[in-house]
């Protein structure tokens, strides 16, 4: 299926040009999305192009500015947040990135009713996290690893925690591993629905081994960055959950929420917290061996001012074939009775589906079913449940939004997005207003992305929020590559692939092939989304065919494929890339003497192992910031898929699956190894060990390091990186410069 029909007519051909590397590096063909910042059922805020904060009322059709760009500029604000009582706005400036989600910033509070900044009892700086209560204008914030509370922005703060200490005790914010591998947020505190209580996590990293690396900077001596970072098998953070009454915070102080007995008996993780009502909270816990998860519903006991988590309100989710959940254990979406909930987990056939849990997990009512997967529950109202899945036309790499009517019996299902802009839009997400009165749909492709506003009752489109007209015009004279998404059936395994073909592709000719791989557990590379990126340029200008293949271990096609890699990382992911390459050669248009593979992070690991597979298929390849041994990576991620690196568990495969063990096999390939020296995620250690093993084996290779760059290799490093990789590939494929 050709997803991007060529608009080229012969008469136009001479005015069309190929993509250039400069186009990609300049972001010339980047797109915009529009996510409303909902503040009620029918109102949302949006930051205009000229930096005013504008309130839109869908029902009145009116909009007006609530905060001028002049006020924003006065404190160099780049972000804002309106208090739910509509009296104040926090303005965020001096953004300073820390890890993937975390950053510090300076915060100013602007009083909208009086048109001035709040003076007196100003916030300290820099703040690690700040948020309004869901009702009114209480503020919770984290400063120097401690949590503070303000009843009103101008009030003095009440200090909730006192034991916070850099790299030791984290209150209300996650440590490195919880941020990256468990919570995927910069915060670890949660207001109850009406702001009565504040729940927070405390992470104790006292006993965690520290990763230390040099940050060269500009000084005479480099700095040393120290991060408590548990690698596979190491001591993990100790987590505790507390809840404090924010109306009378000094009365009883923070109350700890008890951990379920079956979880507390050995090492465990806290995985998420969901408030149900002001006096009911749901916590999710996970054993360190991540195939058992417990969902615990706890109630406030007014008489004792404590939280009670009866065993009858514990729900166990266990996997017998792999780990619990997909990438993360799914979170519950509670219904209006405040006890039953909807949740995605594997059905008896091994497909992730929505289930309704009223009393026990064993008695769960399955809401969706089929040989496809439910991916996200967006919203549950009194009469509808909105979710996304890849059911439509059996393409796993699509996302459509569905509505199930739960108010009627039997429930009826409607695809909201399937036929809206069928050619242009096959991959959606959604954002709902209060009570799902209205919602925004954001379509990511395969055509040019478009964001639209819809009526929550009728699903009628109200207006286009962003259609990327400038991008559409800019692409009119560009020869974009053709893209197709198809599947291979090999030994009862379905391998979906995306092929990116040069604009004047001719099946009778031979083309160099570049495999782009990620391949990590529960990932998906073959998606029906729009992108004009480096590989688009390689196809458009340099005449390469690029292929992405989702092999075993990838997501949204059932547990058989997903859990195939359990305890065996680095085997089937590589095999499936190789199998796909052989199939591509059979198609007749690939020059089998010019095949390369490249990947980043997990993809760097897979590309390295593929190059060292001894098949002779690959002429060259690139690994950017690769994992080289699972003993070097984070405990939470690694052990989920590999178990522990101990003799009585899975040490043998930890040792067998390293890149270093295959150093000899790199002798007959051209290998480019790239890594940032300040990579907090996949440590430079990984590439240092590959390089050492190759040197010891006397194998020639190429390498590039990026000083003081992290896992993202951003800024000027990005330009250097893609220019360098382009030269390497062109040389490998004997393409003239």
């Amino acid at each position: 299926i050709v997803l991007r029909p060529s608009r080229v007519h012969n008469s136009e051909e001479n005015t069309m040009r190929a993509l250039t590397l400069k186009d990609i590096l300049n972001g010339t063909f980047s797109y915009k999305t529009f996510f409303p910042n909902w503040i009620s059922g029918q109102e949302y805020l949006h930051q205009s192009a000229d930096n005013n904060i504008v309130l839109y009322n869908i029902e009145t059709g009116q909009s007006y500015t609530i905060l001028s760009n002049r006020t924003m500029k006065s404190v160099n604000a780049s972000n804002y947040g309106l208090s739910p009582d509509r009296q104040f706005v926090y303005l965020e400036s001096d953004y300073s990135k820390l890890w993937r989600y975390s950053y510090t910033a300076t915060y100013y509070i602007y009083d909208l009713s009086n048109g001035e900044f709040v003076r007196g009892n100003e916030l300290p700086r820099p703040i690690q996290y700040l948020c309004w209560s869901p009702v009114g204008s209480k503020l919770a914030y984290v400063y120097q690893n401690n949590i503070y509370l303000k009843q009103r922005p101008g009030d003095p703060p009440f200090q909730i925690t006192f034991n916070g200490r850099e790299n030791k005790i984290f209150n209300g914010i996650p440590d490195w591993v919880y941020e990256e591998e468990m919570l995927a947020t910069k915060y670890a505190l949660w207001w109850s629905p009406n702001g009565k209580f504040l729940a927070y996590a405390e992470f104790n990293d006292t006993d965690i081994p520290v990763i230390a690396y040099s940050y060269y900077g500009d000084e005479q001596y480099p700095r040393t960055i120290n991060i408590p970072y548990p690698k596979a098998g190491a001591k993990n953070p100790v987590v505790r959950i507390f809840i404090i009454d924010t109306t009378y915070p000094a009365y009883v102080g923070p109350q700890e929420v008890p951990v379920p007995a079956m979880i507390a008996s050995s090492d465990y993780y806290f995985s998420w917290l969901t408030w149900v009502t002001d006096e009911r909270v749901c916590l999710q816990w996970l054993k360190r061996v991540q195939n058992v998860s417990v969902l615990s519903i706890c109630d406030f006991r007014e008489d004792w001012q404590t939280w009670d988590c009866p065993k009858t309100q514990e729900h166990i989710e266990e996997s017998r074939t792999g780990w619990a959940g997909g990438f993360f254990v799914s979170t519950p979406v509670f219904s209006y009775d405040a006890i039953s909930y909807y949740k995605i987990f594997s059905d008896k056939d091994g497909y992730k589906h929505i289930h309704y849990i009223k009393d026990t997990v064993e008695n769960a009512i399955q809401i969706t079913s089929g040989k496809w997967e439910a991916i996200n529950i967006f919203r549950v109202t009194q009469d509808s449940l909105f979710y996304s899945s890849n059911e439509f036309e059996e393409y796993p790499g699509r996302r459509n939004i569905y509505r199930i009517s739960i108010g009627s019996y039997p429930p009826s299902k409607k695809c909201v997005t399937c036929h809206l802009r069928k050619e242009r839009c096959q991959y959606y997400t959604a954002s709902f207003s209060d009570y799902a009165k209205y919602y925004a749909l954001v379509c990511y492709g395969p055509g040019i992305p478009i964001s639209t506003l819809h009526d929550g009752r009728t699903d009628q489109e109200i207006k286009i929020l962003e259609e990327n007209k400038e991008l559409e015009n800019a692409l009119k004279n560009i020869q974009l590559p053709k893209e197709e998404i198809k599947k291979l059936e090999v030994d009862e395994i379905t391998l979906w692939y995306k092929m990116i073909l040069p604009p004047q592709f001719d099946r009778s000719k031979k083309y160099p092939l570049l495999i782009q791989v990620y391949g990590g557990p529960c990932s998906q590379s073959v998606r029906s989304v729009f992108a004009v990126n480096w590989i688009s340029y390689l196809a458009s200008k340099e005449g390469m065919v690029i292929a992405l293949v989702d092999g075993r271990g990838t997501a949204f096609q059932g547990d058989k494929l997903l859990y195939a890699v359990y305890r065996k990382l680095g085997v089937y992911e590589v095999e499936d890339q190789i199998t796909a390459v052989r199939k591509f050669i059979e198609m007749g248009f690939i020059d089998e003497k010019r095949i390369a593979i490249w990947g980043w992070s997990y993809g760097g690991y897979v590309s390295s192992l593929a190059l060292a597979s001894g098949t002779g298929l690959f002429k060259c390849g690139i690994a950017v910031a690769p994992v080289s041994s699972w003993e070097y990576y984070a405990s939470v991620y690694t052990e989920r898929f590999m178990g522990l690196p101990t003799k009585d568990d899975n040490l043998e495969h930890y040792k067998n699956s390293t890149v270093m063990a295959r150093a000899e096999y790199f002798r007959n390939v051209d290998y480019l190894l790239i890594h940032g020296t300040a990579d907090d995620n996949v440590h430079f250690q990984n590439s240092a060990q590959i390089a050492k093993a190759l040197v010891n084996a006397q194998v020639d290779f190429q390498a590039m390091w990026y000083s003081d760059q992290n896992h993202g290799l951003s800024g000027l490093s990005t330009n250097h990186l893609y220019t360098h990789m382009t030269h390497f590939l062109k040389q490998c494929f004997s393409l003239s410069d």
């Epitope: 029918q42 059709g61 509509r86 209060d434 009165k437």
Partner: nanobody, 117 residues
Framework: QVQLQESGGGLVQAGGSLRLSCAAS????????MGWYRQAPGKRRELVAF???????YYTDSVKGRFTISTENDKNTVYLQMNSLKPEDTAVYYC???????????WGQGTQVTVSS
């Protein structure tokens, strides 16, 4: 731009009631979320209550259960029914959009409410 005119204030004893009115130059429905604000002597103006076009309401903690905000769309009017008044409710009361606009809408004169003990 919207013109707003507040009325209905006065002197009342503690425990008494007042009903404030706010007349708008056009349909309340077309304006959007409307709020009642107040400013006590020497204090900053604060939002007391607001009402959205679908009649969801919000009240500041100190007036919950005593004040009621409502609209009469055909009369282009927003009301604030104030019961069980306390001396600390003494202030000039204003109506405006919630949050206020910076696009040139002006605050009205307000209406004085005085609660004696």
């Amino acid at each position: 731009q919207v013109q707003l005119q507040e009325s209905g204030g006065g002197l009342v004893q503690a425990g008494g009631s007042l009903r404030l009115s706010c007349a708008a130059s056009r349909s309340i429905f077309s304006i959007g979320t409307m709020g009642w604000y107040r400013q006590a002597p020497g204090k900053r103006r604060e939002l007391v209550a607001f009402i959205t076009v679908d009649h969801n309401t919000y009240y500041t903690d100190s007036v919950k259960g005593r004040f009621t905000i409502s609209t009469e769309n055909d009369k282009n009017t927003v009301y604030l029914q104030m019961n069980s008044l306390k001396p600390e409710d003494t202030a000039v009361y204003y109506c405006n959009r919630a949050p206020p606009s910076t696009d040139g809408d002006r605050w009205g004169q307000g209406t004085q409410v005085t609660v004696s003990s």
